[in-house]
């Protein structure tokens, strides 16, 4: 199809080279078609319109995402070329960042209705580049946590160095839709709840003589209770003895709950004693069974393939650990009767 | 308890114009949007539009813009809106509600309302 | 703009019916629907938020349902105190709409 009809846009996504981030661009498709395909709202020249949220769009019609390559070949489709980006309804999401993202997009509905929604497209063009390693050191990360039920901050990565009072109007998004009522380059939250976790991207425009850029940053918001004061505890084995049949295989396993921790490096290890010798066993790797915004539940087996009369000798250690402490429970086995 | 005191009834010709005060008590002013809605009598709820206390950014209703400005004193906790140009169809009852959820979010719901500021447009 | 459709306007019932109220978006609203509840010379008062979430202090006998375009609100018993207009609200994107109310009478 012919795309110089096509509204533009560019943007420019100055990644950070120490952080992992994503990126996205939203379908902004012009009225009357954006109702139509996207259910944006209309709003007045001076508001910005809403975007379609990245859930709840099951029912909503798609838009067709195209790659525009730069030595003039034909359009590329996405979905089949590019595995790292993904397309999202009316969003083009971007999972790892590189100059080879720079390039045009072009997005359109996927079922033409009329002969006008034929030029109804846009074309985004994107400069990707590193950020300047002399851009300062304190840069809001694209990852940022909000503890639940104290006051805090969102700040937008590209515009973090700023005073409030220098700073640019900024446009911010959550979960893809529209956040009017905010425009400075760091939200506050008084009193943080559940519902503030979800991605925000914060807009705003950067002019040179020769053209205006929309710069653009998406950060991941998580909400999180305060780090646990407690040791893990071991949910199972409760027991200290464990009546086995010899010569019969053996799982025993260890379950163990760790409270949340923003930096978590949980320890789980199944040691045995024989005597006076204490050794680490080779088990499977440990696995989360249930997670929480207060803790985690992480489970790790040992497996005896025959159990013989030496393990009857032997005691069974699990031991957990975390930042505050470590846990032991024992176990040691008796043969059923 | 969270509350909204409107100002009182105001009688107002063709032309002019009305300032509808919302005073808010029970509640960290800053952290919750303010809605202004309005009824003409007998009829439903029509939305004009929002403020954000923190910042004082707004968001007009298309039919309304031009016409509506929102302010509000943080000192005071109190939220402002002023209609001009008024004419006989907004005669109505003018409602502030609070917004349920602390911002920033999607809208939730006005979970307080104040009594409400009867405006009657009249030659 | 939303347009938000409200079915009935009016309705007449006995204290112990149940009432079912219908209100359908103009598109696709998700969950942003919410429920107010107002008597004359009141303000109204928020029910059902979330589509389905019943605000603190509201009886059980309030429910709302669905997703999308199509909702409604139920009162499994109806009690003297409910007799007043309904109202339903979208707050998916601005400007924020609301039905045209169904005003439940006694039969």
């Known amino acids: 199809f012919n795309i110089s009809g096509c509204s533009t846009k560019k943007l420019l996504w100055a990644y950070s080279t120490r952080s992992e981030e994503e990126f996205i661009l939203f379908c902004d498709l012009p009225e009357p078609q954006k109702s139509h395909f996207c259910h944006r709202s209309q709003l007045s020249p001076t508001q910005v319109p809403d975007h379609l949220p990245f859930t709840d769009s099951k029912d909503l019609p798609d838009v067709q995402w195209y790659r525009q390559p730069s030595n003039g070949d034909p359009l590329e489709d996405i979905r089949k070329s590019y595995p790292h980006i993904i397309q999202d309804k009316c969003t083009l999401r971007f999972l790892t960042p590189g100059v080879n993202n720079t390039g045009s997009y072009i997005c359109r509905p996927k079922m033409i209705k009329s002969p006008y929604d034929v030029a109804c497209c846009v074309k985004m063009i994107l400069e990707v580049k590193p950020q300047s390693n002399a851009s300062c050191e304190n840069s809001a990360s694209h990852k940022q946590d909000l503890l639940l039920g104290s006051t805090g901050s969102i700040s937008c990565p590209s515009l973090s160095c700023q005073s409030d009072a220098q700073s640019p109007e900024v446009t911010w998004y959550k979960n893809g839709k529209l956040l009017s009522m905010t425009r400075s380059n760091r939200i506050v939250v008084d009193e943080v709840y559940i519902y503030h976790q979800g991605t925000y991207v914060c807009d705003y425009t950067q002019s040179d003589t020769a053209s205006s850029w929309t710069v653009r940053a998406v950060v991941q918001v998580r909400t999180i209770v305060g780090d646990t004061k407690l040791k893990p505890d071991i949910l199972d084995p409760v027991e200290s003895t464990l009546e086995v049949e010899l010569g019969k295989p053996l799982t025993i396993s260890c379950k163990a709950r760790f409270g949340f921790e923003r930096v978590f490096n949980p320890v789980m290890k199944w040691y045995i004693k024989d005597a006076d010798l204490e050794w680490e066993v080779s088990v499977p790797e440990a696995k989360s069974i249930k997670s929480t915004l207060k803790d985690e539940i992480i489970e790790r087996n040992i497996i005896l393939e025959k159990v013989t009369q030496r393990d009857l000798r032997r005691t069974f250690v699990c031991f957990v650990q975390n930042s505050i402490g470590n846990t032991t429970q024992s176990v040691q086995l008796k043969e059923k009767r | 308890q969270v509350q909204l005191v409107q100002s009182g009834a105001e009688v107002k010709k063709p032309g002019a114009s009305v300032k509808v005060s919302c005073k808010a008590s029970?509640?960290?002013?800053?952290?919750?949007?303010m809605h202004w809605v309005r009824q003409a009598p007998g009829q439903g709820l029509e939305w004009m539009g929002i403020?954000?206390?923190?910042?004082?950014?707004?968001t007009y209703a298309q039919k309304f813009q031009g016409r509506v400005t929102m302010t509000r004193d943080t000192s005071t906790s109190t939220v402002y809106m002023e209609l001009s140009s008024l004419r006989s169809e907004d005669t109505a009852v003018y409602y502030c509600?609070?917004?349920?959820?602390?911002?920033?979010?999607?809208?939730?719901?006005?979970?307080?309302w104040g009594q409400g500021t009867t405006v009657t447009v009249s030659s | 703009d939303i347009q938000m459709t409200q079915s009935p306007s009016s309705l007449s019932a006995s204290v112990g019916d149940r009432v079912t109220i219908t209100c359908r978006a103009s598109?696709?609203?998700?969950?942003?629907l919410n429920w107010y509840q107002q008597k004359p010379g009141k303000a109204p008062k928020l029910l059902i938020y979330?589509?389905?979430s019943l605000q603190s202090g509201v009886p059980s006998r309030f429910s709302g349902s669905g997703s999308g375009t199509d909702f409604t609100l139920t009162m499994s018993s109806l009690q003297p105190e409910d007799f007043a207009t309904y109202y339903c609200?979208?707050?998916?994107?601005?400007?924020?709409?609301f039905g045209g109310g169904t005003k439940v009478e006694i039969k």
């Open positions: 598109q696709s609203i998700s969950s942003y």
């Open positions: 403020i954000n206390p923190r910042g004082g950014y707004t």
């Open positions: 029970g509640y960290t002013f800053t952290s919750y949007y």
């Open positions: 979330d589509a389905s």
């Open positions: 609200q979208q707050s998916y994107s601005t400007p924020l709409t």
């Open positions: 509600a609070k917004e349920g959820r602390v911002s920033p979010t999607d809208y939730y719901g006005m979970d307080v």
